[in-house]
């Protein structure tokens, strides 16, 4: 007698490993013999699909080599024209041993930055990821964390974080290890011991000592008055990432000696500097007043700023006033390379006129200080931001020598033009090149109508009350 199909063994959930065989059985009783079709996620499996084998009149579906994409709901449907079609469904869960799909790579990082070592994994059940540093499991802390993705994140990298790392992916089916990678921590060059200033007699031997560290170990070079050291012997030693350099000098003139420690980080360099002055005791020019004398300026640094053949005051408290004052300007001038184009010409004029003050000749040559109002104009109009930074550095003792203190006058201690117009020096007009100086820093929102031929004149930002007394 005709009999409608009945599925006697309903489909069950099947667990299978990748690359293994998985079989679903759909036993059917019916008369006449039914037609059995199979679907995966409601999509018909074609009889000629070579990834599958369908046997026993369609009652057995075999996946010949399971892939992780085969997971899903499989259904068999039986129909023989008697009664309705019947269906049974079961799930295929593809189990997978851990696999590291994005392994970590060697990393070079600068101390203090953030490092991320990738470790992306696959597997079912989802693998847990841990890390090994050297031979020991890595412990997480406030700086070191294993992210959800499995990657290792290290905040504020320290020297001690350097070493060999590997990630470990683990689930119930097995464990996978990445290859070992190296985390190298680089450290900016830093001076541990700065050379000390000396006041010595003519013809003395002096040894300047400079110690620096960094990763990689820095090199040390010595600069004398802005140029590479031309005389003297240098001895160096390296121990435990610390380089020690000693410069031995035979002193015949005063000078400014700078120790420069440099190391390389990829394409970039880091540099640390420290300077010392060598002055010569009891070494004054004969037949000069003991405070100073007037002479024409013969230096280079202030050539463009001081009037041609300007008579300047040379201070005999220095062993060699011309050279010492030129060094002072030179040192401070180098600091000005980083200031804004608005500030620089004003600061240069102030600096040169302050260190090489106008000289009033007479029985007692007298320096003529800059007028207070010109100093204030430079401080508050042209160089407001830079001045604040410089003063802060001075208070915090970031300047090693007194040079910067000497370089920048204290405006309030200078004479006012109101007191005696001849007792103080005016700074020359500051010319601004329209091409070089595109904007004058706008420090307020006010925009007065100002017609300034020597300054750029865009309507919005070129001169909105700038250089300005309004510093916001």
């Amino acid at each position: 007698l005709p009999k409608a199909p009945v599925i006697t063994t309903p489909l069950e959930t099947v667990d299978a490993l990748v690359e293994e065989v998985a079989t679903f059985m759909c036993a059917v009783e019916s008369y006449p013999q039914p037609e059995i079709s199979w679907t995966r996620n409601k999509i018909l499996i074609k009889l000629f699909d070579t990834r599958y084998s369908i046997r026993e009149n369609g009652q057995l579906l075999t996946i010949l080599s399971v892939e992780d994409s085969d997971d899903g709901i499989y259904c068999c449907t039986a129909n023989n024209g008697v009664g309705g079609a019947v269906e049974s469904c079961g799930a295929l869960q593809v189990k997978m041993k851990p696999k590291i799909t994005r392994p970590p790579i060697n990393v070079k990082i600068i101390e203090g930055l953030k490092a991320v070592l990738p470790c992306t994994t696959m597997g079912n059940p989802k693998p847990s990821v841990s890390w090994i540093k050297g031979d020991s499991p890595l412990r997480e802390n406030s700086r070191i964390a294993v992210l959800e993705s499995g990657s290792l994140r290290i905040h504020n990298v320290q020297k001690e974080d350097a070493g060999q790392y590997r990630c470990v992916a683990k689930n119930s089916l097995g464990t996978a290890y990445s290859k070992v990678v190296k985390l190298e921590v680089e450290v900016f060059a830093r001076i541990l011991r700065a050379p000390e200033s000396h006041n010595v007699t003519f013809g003395s031997f002096v040894t300047l000592h400079c110690t620096a560290t960094g990763i990689p170990v820095p090199t040390i070079t010595w600069i004398e008055n802005g140029n590479a050291v031309s005389s003297g012997s240098i001895q160096e030693s390296v121990k435990d990432r610390v380089i020690d350099s000693r410069l031995q000098l035979f002193i015949t003139k005063p000078g400014l000696y700078t120790c420069i420690a440099t190391n390389k980080h990829g394409e970039k360099f880091s540099t640390a500097k420290a300077a010392a002055t060598i002055s010569i005791a009891e070494w004054s020019k004969p037949q000069k007043d003991n405070k100073g004398y007037c002479a024409q300026y013969r230096g280079e640094v202030c050539n463009a700023v001081l009037a041609k053949d300007a008579l300047v005051f040379l201070n005999t408290s220095y062993a060699d006033p011309e050279e010492a004052q030129e060094l002072l300007v030179h040192t401070a001038w180098n600091e000005l390379k980083v200031v804004s184009p608005v500030c620089r010409p004003a600061a240069e004029a102030l600096l040169c006129n302050h260190i090489f003050q106008e000289c009033s000749p007479g029985v007692v040559p007298t320096p003529i200080p800059i007028c207070r109002e010109y100093c204030l104009a430079v401080k508050e109009l042209f160089c407001a931001k830079e001045w604040l930074v410089m003063e802060e550095k001075t208070h915090r003792g970031l300047y090693r020598s007194e040079m910067h203190l000497l370089s920048v006058p204290e405006c309030s201690k200078l004479p006012s033009m109101h007191w005696d117009p001849t007792a103080c020096a005016r700074l020359p007009h500051l010319d601004y090149n329209k091409e070089n100086l595109k904007t004058f820093p706008p420090m307020t929102s006010s925009k007065p109508s100002v017609d300034i031929p020597n300054l750029p004149s865009s309507s919005s930002s070129s001169f909105s009350v700038s250089p300005t007394y309004s510093m916001t």
Epitope: C371, R372, E373, Y374, L376, A377, E380, L381, A384, S416, M417, H418, P421, R426, H429, L430, T444, S446, P448, S449, V450, D451, I452, P453, N454, V465, S466, P467, T468, Y469, S470, M471, T472
Partner: antibody, heavy 124, light 107 residues
């Protein structure tokens, strides 16, 4: 002795024009900054305009911008204020004052010398 | 624009009193602040320049000081000739503004 003498004030109808002069002696206009400051009857001081001859630069208060023009003739050591499109609210005593130095330092010097003032009345 | 708010607008004091007048700038300004004295029918006279410098010929009882955006004129011991109106003034390059004035009257 430093002196500033204003002239050119008077009665003018709204929309009319006047030119004020400020004759300086005892100093050179070219090395100083000259300012015009006005004071409406019973009111406070209001800055009008400034000029620094050494820079040839000028500046104006918003209330007069486009209507007033400040200038200086260094050969005559005199500064001027050309006032056009006058309004009733421009009625005031107009003072000229000087501050020593160019545009950058003059603010620190204060206006140390003032003229006696000249009255401008704008009325129909 | 920078506003200079002067206070008080008027005050009554006796000879010998210590008098303080304050000007507050609406935003940070430099030390280019001056103080003037004006008597009725006369031009103003400069007393203090650069916030705290005493102009020549001005009695030492007048002094100026600064604290941030606050500028102060102090008369240490008021004299009969000091009864007048006082103005503060700040200078930009150039954007000049005056305070509204403080009238010092006899009590």
């Amino acid at each position: 002795e430093v002196q500033l003498v204003e002239s050119g004030g008077g009665l003018v109808q709204p929309g009319g024009s006047l030119r004020l002069s400020c004759a300086a002696s005892g100093f050179t206009v070219s090395s100083s900054s000259i300012h015009w400051v006005r004071q409406a009857p019973g009111k406070g001081l209001e800055w009008v305009a400034s000029i620094s001859s050494s820079y040839g630069s000028t500046s104006y208060a918003d209330s007069v911008k486009g209507r007033f023009t400040i200038s200086a003739d260094t050969s005559k050591n005199t500064a001027y204020l050309q006032m056009n499109s006058l309004r009733a609210e421009d009625t005031a005593v107009y003072y000229c004052a000087r501050s020593e130095g160019d545009r950058y330092v003059s603010g620190y010097m204060g206006m140390d010398y003032w003229g006696q003032g000249t009255l401008v009345t704008v009325s129909s | 624009d920078i506003q200079m708010t002067q206070s008080p607008s008027s005050l009554s004091a006796s000879v010998g009193d210590r008098v303080t007048i304050t000007c507050r700038a609406s935003q940070s300004v430099s030390s280019a602040v001056a103080w003037y004295q004006q008597k009725p029918g006369k031009a103003p006279k400069l007393l203090i320049y650069s916030a705290s410098s005493l102009y020549s010929g001005v009695p030492s009882r007048f002094s100026g000081s600064r604290s941030g955006t606050d500028f102060t004129l102090t008369i240490s011991s008021l004299q009969p000739e000091d009864f007048a109106t006082y103005y503060c003034q700040q200078s930009g390059v150039w954007l000049i503004t005056f305070g509204q004035g403080t009238k010092v009257e006899i009590k």
